[in-house]
Interface confidence: low
């Protein structure tokens, strides 16, 4: 009878053979059945499982001229590239029937030259601080010594004695390289080689040295930066993320910190131009040839007030009898801090100066003594924050009011206003 | 307000050249690199070209160089892209971006580009 | 240049879900890392810089983590406006270098 007919018969009349090689190989597997009416599907297994992607051809030749005559087919299983997970036990599988029948096994195996799974990469790191670099490599055959290299000089005295998967080195005070071998029967493997950048370490101790109101001076201590001097540090400054642009009446300040580079020595760096009475981030990092250290922590400074840098403006005094009346202006120069109130000074030709603190109010009345016959009073005002006063206007003389005259104002010749703090700040 | 407002986009032959603007305004343009970016169909970003503050330096990926050229108007506040000899592989979404010290804080709203014959 | 890797392309999560999206370096960018939104239509938005600093107006919800190569941006509880396409990008060397992109789709 025709094979495939009867349930215990196999069909299979060629069974997988076997394959062994080394990663990267290219095999084929071939099995082969006789079966009497329409060819089955040929199922690939491996280990007992089906392999549902597999990389299979399948060709049918009948044995007559009817369809229900004897099949010849062939099914070939290619395995394009070695690979540790294509070993295991081959068979194919094919459903006749209502019975499944499963060919002899063929193995394939893998043997050859190491395999790295892991290989140390390229990173850089600061001078003189720890760190540890992976190589990781398998067989088959097994077992498989790793042995280290740096700078192409060997670690250990040979494979499998020196430190294996984890190198831990302890510091590095040049820019290094690092490469693995890995050693089996069948001979050795080289890993790629990393390069290890030695970068200057982290800078400590940024602090401020002096503060004005418009000026900040800072310093800190440099890090090891290994064979490789520093050329130069960069600094960052940025305002800090509250509403003084708002307050000093400008749009909301940049978002992107303005960059400085100091020359080094010193380690020490002015910053000019700031806004008083202002809050501000810096940080700093130190280059050398081989590339940037990690930037240091933002550092919260502040600068102190100020004050005022114009006097106020608009100063109208006008004069009834033994009352004056004075009012006048914000500076419209900056401020440079909070605005804590006005000075008023008057004086007449050979009277003492009084001097009166009116807070915060922009208009004052003044009791003269003897009704009026003090001759030619002038009036001054200055504007103060917590720092100390600002400078005094220009002396006013005080005019007698008629009634049907308008108040006579005299405006002051403005003193040129500091540039706007616009950023950049300096 | 940063606002950036790309236009010149449009449907050309391969070979064909095609000038992109982007019109800017809200910030001091002066101070700040810019960016042109596009975004290819398959909805991958590539940058295209950058230009430092003043004009003096660009730079170009190998893909657009000496096919692309960046330049700036500073008195107009307005970046150009000049696209020469294109190919069916520029066809994207293209935009400009303003450059900050650490990313692109600001994009434009994008101008088409469609090389097709 | 280096390269950005966005092992992700597409992400599922439901509303008010934790989600991670993750980002390769192919070498230390120190933390030089920006992350953008592009929602349906629009352009890119910057949301976080410097690895983990929140631009202006992004909610907290969105944070960013990481160091030496590998970085994570999270977002702590999912919203439906999040449906976006998101892209690290490194601004440790110009030129700056994006991810191929993780799409977020809300269950």
């Known amino acids: 009878a025709p094979r495939g007919t009867q349930a215990e018969e196999s069909p299979f009349v060629g069974n997988p053979g076997n394959i062994t090689g080394a990663r990267g190989l290219t095999g084929t597997l071939r099995c082969q059945l006789q079966v009497q009416g329409e060819p089955p599907e040929v199922h690939w297994l491996r280990d007992g499982q089906i392999l549902e992607l597999a990389d299979s051809t399948q060709t049918q030749v009948p044995l007559g001229e009817d369809e229900q005559d004897d099949w010849i087919v062939v099914s070939q299983l290619r395995i394009a590239s070695l690979q540790l997970s294509d070993a295991g036990q081959y068979q194919c599988l094919v459903f006749l029937g209502h019975q499944n029948f499963v060919s002899q096994p063929g193995y394939v195996g893998l043997e050859g030259l190491p395999y790295f799974l892991e290989e140390p990469e390229d990173r850089t790191v600061a001078a003189n601080t720890p760190f540890n670099l992976s190589c990781q490599a398998q067989g088959p055959p097994e077992p498989v010594d790793l042995l280290w290299l740096q700078d192409a000089v060997p670690l250990a005295t040979a494979p499998g004695h020196g430190p294996q998967r984890n190198l831990h080195v302890p510091g590095l005070n040049k820019t290094s390289s690092f490469s693995c071998e890995a050693h089996n029967a069948k001979g050795v493997t080289t890993s790629r080689t990393a390069t290890i950048t030695v970068l200057p370490q982290q800078p400590r101790n940024l602090h401020l040295v002096s503060r004005q109101p418009t000026e900040l001076e800072v310093a800190w201590t440099p890090g090891l930066s290994g064979i490789y001097p520093l050329t130069h540090c960069t600094l960052q400054a940025m305002l800090s993320d509250n509403e003084v642009g708002i307050q000093a009446g400008e749009p909301d300040p940049p978002e992107e910190p303005l960059t400085l580079q100091a020359s080094v020595p010193p380690h020490q760096l002015r910053l000019g131009s700031l806004h008083p009475h202002t809050p501000y981030h810096i940080r700093v990092a130190c280059t050398s040839s081989q590339g940037p250290s990690s930037w240091t922590h933002w550092l919260p400074v502040e600068t102190p007030e100020g004050v005022p840098l114009g006097p106020p403006e608009n100063i109208s005094a006008t004069r009834n009898g033994s009352q004056a009346f004075v009012h006048w202006q914000e500076p419209p120069a900056p401020l440079q801090g909070t605005l804590l109130g006005y000075r008023l000074a008057y004086q007449g030709q050979d009277t003492p100066e009084v001097l009166m603190d009116i807070g915060l109010r922009q208009e004052v009345t003044l009791e003269l003594q003897g009704d009026g016959s003090v001759s030619n009073l002038t009036v001054c005002v200055a504007a103060y924050t917590a720092a100390g006063d600002g400078p005094w206007s220009l002396p006013v003389p005080l005019e007698a009011w008629r009634p049907g005259q308008a108040q006579p104002v005299h405006q002051l010749v403005k003193e040129t206003s500091a540039p706007a703090f616009s950023w950049p700040w300096w | 307000e940063v606002k950036l407002v790309e236009s010149g986009g449009g449907l050309v032959q391969p070979g064909g050249s095609l000038k992109l603007s982007c019109a800017t305004s809200?910030?001091?343009?002066?101070?700040?690199?810019m960016y042109w970016v596009r975004q290819t169909p398959e909805k991958r970003l590539e940058w295209v070209a950058y230009?430092?503050?003043?004009?003096?330096?660009?730079y170009y990926p190998d893909t657009v160089k000496g096919r692309f050229t960046m330049s700036r108007d500073n008195a107009k506040n307005t970046l150009y892209l000049q696209m020469s000899r294109l190919k069916s592989e520029d066809t994207a979404m293209y935009y400009c971006?303003?450059?900050?010290?650490?990313?692109?804080?600001?994009w434009g709203q994008g101008t088409s580009v469609t090389v097709s014959s | 240049d280096i390269v950005m890797t966005q092992s992700h392309k597409f992400m599922s999560t439901s509303v008010g879900d934790r989600v991670s999206i993750t980002c390769k370096a192919s070498?230390?960018?120190?933390?030089?890392v920006a992350w953008y939104q592009q929602k349906p239509g629009q352009s890119p938005k910057l949301l976080i810089y410097?690895?983990?600093t929140r631009h202006t107006g992004v909610p907290d919800r969105f944070t960013g983590s990481g160091s030496g190569t590998d970085y994570t941006l999270t977002i702590s509880s999912v919203q439906a406006e999040d449906l976006a396409l998101y892209y690290c990008?490194?601004?440790?060397?110009?030129?700056?270098?994006f991810g191929s992109g993780t799409k977020l789709e809300i269950k």
């Open positions: 070498q230390d960018v120190t933390t030089a």
């Open positions: 809200g910030f001091t343009f002066s101070d700040y690199y």
């Open positions: 230009i430092s503050n003043g004009g003096g330096s660009t």
């Open positions: 971006a303003r450059l900050s010290f650490y990313a692109m804080d600001y």
């Open positions: 990008q490194q601004h440790y060397r110009i030129p700056f270098t």
């Open positions: 410097w690895a983990s």
